[in-house]
């Protein structure tokens, strides 16, 4: 199992800081964090050492290490808290896309452990969230929307408590996906039309579900026929 | 609000074992890192042993001074970390203190006192 | 293993006074210092950590300062509350090790 440096769990910084982070393995060793400027890599053998001398609010994120030649698959991981008094948030991505019924994980993470307290969920213009929003918060993570509906596709934004007032992240789009329970039902009418060449005719393709997001298309044995 | 508290501390012989507890609150233990730090006015503070979290395999560490001696472990159920002392020496004797790692020793409980002495 | 030498390890001083506490590290630790304070029958407590940041509820009197091998705690306006024992304490890797400590004691 790799072991990174320093040996702490959360680290807090200031930003401009110099930061290091070193991984050692038994073997090679990889990084993984969120995408952010600045970090330059140096690899050597079995250790690996991630460096930058102008920490931002963007590096704000987990780092984790992993041995890709351990069969056990261990890692290790170290949070890092860039600490911004103008940028309490850093957005990881500006777009969710999760099917119904799945947790949605809005990526915006807290640049300062000591914010937390005061951190709350809205959606944009800050109108409140839906009736019935089941949500949780992480500092390492983001806020988490349990078990989300078709109805909660909205823009949200994440919002935190920095002297007495509130300090709003960029957006975050959130779309959830209805489940298909099954093949739609397809009707074709009528069954049987009979017309003389040159004739109008009146072919009805219908589908149920049509809030799901599904192609309807004739087909006449293998040619797509424009409607 | 975090509370950390140790027990089991004791006089014990040369070469006889204890086991101290911590009862950890107020905190996700199962998230937590834990460590025993202990002091002598010899010594001064010193590091003993760590068990990180879960998601960090349950991995442990030892001070020089203590490898194959003790055992630190933990049960996330309980939120309750354990160190198993065996082949007691004096120079073991000190207050143990159990801590809580985040940024740095975040946490530390009030300390159990043990004298090794014959 | 990284050693830790703290200096002075004691120091008389009146209320009021500024005072500043350091600490070596044998080789590089990259700002990964912790600072604690020790009252007198207490347990430690957490001042700085990361070299430069305040623990949560330390007055601002407090500072850290210091990169590579060389650390420093600094308390302006000393206050009655700040006597007792400092320590420093580095993060990188394990064994952790602390430094001697700093007793400070009122003149």
């Known amino acids: 199992i790799p072991v990174i440096e320093p040996s702490v769990p959360e680290l807090v910084v200031k930003p401009g800081a110099t930061v290091t982070l070193r991984c050692v393995g038994n073997g090679s060793v990889e990084w993984d964090g969120p995408p952010s400027p600045h970090w330059t890599l140096y690899s050597d053998g079995s250790s690996s050492i991630l460096s930058t001398n102008n920490a931002t609010f963007q590096n704000t994120g987990t780092y984790r290490c992993t041995e890709p030649g351990d069969p056990l698959g261990g890692s290790a991981a170290i949070h890092l808290y860039v600490k911004d008094p103008a940028r309490p948030w850093n957005v990881l991505a500006q777009e969710v896309v999760v099917f119904e019924d799945q947790d949605a994980l809005l990526p915006c993470l807290l640049t300062d452990p000591v914010l937390e307290a005061g951190v709350s969920l809205v959606r944009v213009r800050g109108r409140p969230l839906m009736r019935h929003t089941n949500y949780s918060f992480s500092p390492w993570h983001g806020f988490t929307i349990h078990r989300a509906k078709f109805i909660q596709s909205q823009d949200y934004q994440c919002s935190a408590l920095m002297g007495g007032r509130k300090v709003m992240s960029i957006s975050i789009r959130l779309k959830v996906q209805k489940v298909i329970p099954g093949p739609p039902a397809l009707t074709l009418v009528p069954a049987e039309l009979v017309r003389i060449r040159g004739e109008a005719a009146q072919i009805v393709c219908s589908a149920s579900s049509v809030d799901v997001n599904f192609d309807v298309f004739l087909q006449h044995n293998n040619t797509k026929l424009a409607i | 609000e975090v509370k950390l508290e140790e027990s089991g501390g004791g006089l014990v012989q040369p070469g006889g074992s204890m086991k101290l507890s911590c009862a950890a609150s107020?905190?996700?233990?199962?998230?937590?890192?834990m460590d025993w730090v202990r002091q002598s006015p010899e010594m001064g503070l010193e590091w003993v042993a760590e068990?990180?979290?879960?998601?960090?395999?349950?991995?442990?560490f030892y001070a020089e001074s203590v490898k194959g001696r003790f055992t630190i472990s933990r049960d996330d159920s309980k939120s309750s970390v354990y160190l198993q002392m065996n082949s007691l020496r004096p120079e073991d004797t000190g207050i143990y203190y159990c801590?809580?790692?985040?940024?740095?020793?975040?946490?530390w409980g009030q300390g159990t006192t043990l004298t090794v002495s014959s | 293993d990284i050693q830790m030498t703290q200096s002075p390890a004691s120091l008389s001083v009146s209320v009021g006074e500024t005072v500043t506490i350091t600490c070596r590290a044998s080789?590089?630790?990259?700002?990964?210092l912790a600072w604690y304070q020790q009252k007198q029958g207490k347990s430690p407590q957490l001042l700085v950590h990361?070299?430069?940041n305040l623990a949560d509820g330390v007055p601002s009197r407090f500072s850290g300062s210091g990169s590579g091998t060389q650390y420093s705690l600094k308390i302006n306006s000393l206050q009655s509350e700040d006597f007792g024992s400092y320590y420093c304490?580095?993060?990188?890797?394990?064994?952790?090790?602390f430094g001697g400590g700093t007793k400070l004691e009122i003149k």
């Open positions: 080789e590089n630790i990259y700002s990964n």
């Open positions: 801590t809580r790692v985040k940024v740095g020793f975040d946490n």
């Open positions: 304490q580095h993060f990188w890797g394990t064994p952790r090790t």
């Open positions: 990361a070299a430069t």
């Open positions: 107020g905190f996700t233990f199962s998230d937590a890192w």
């Open positions: 068990i990180r979290s879960k998601a960090n395999n349950h991995a442990t």
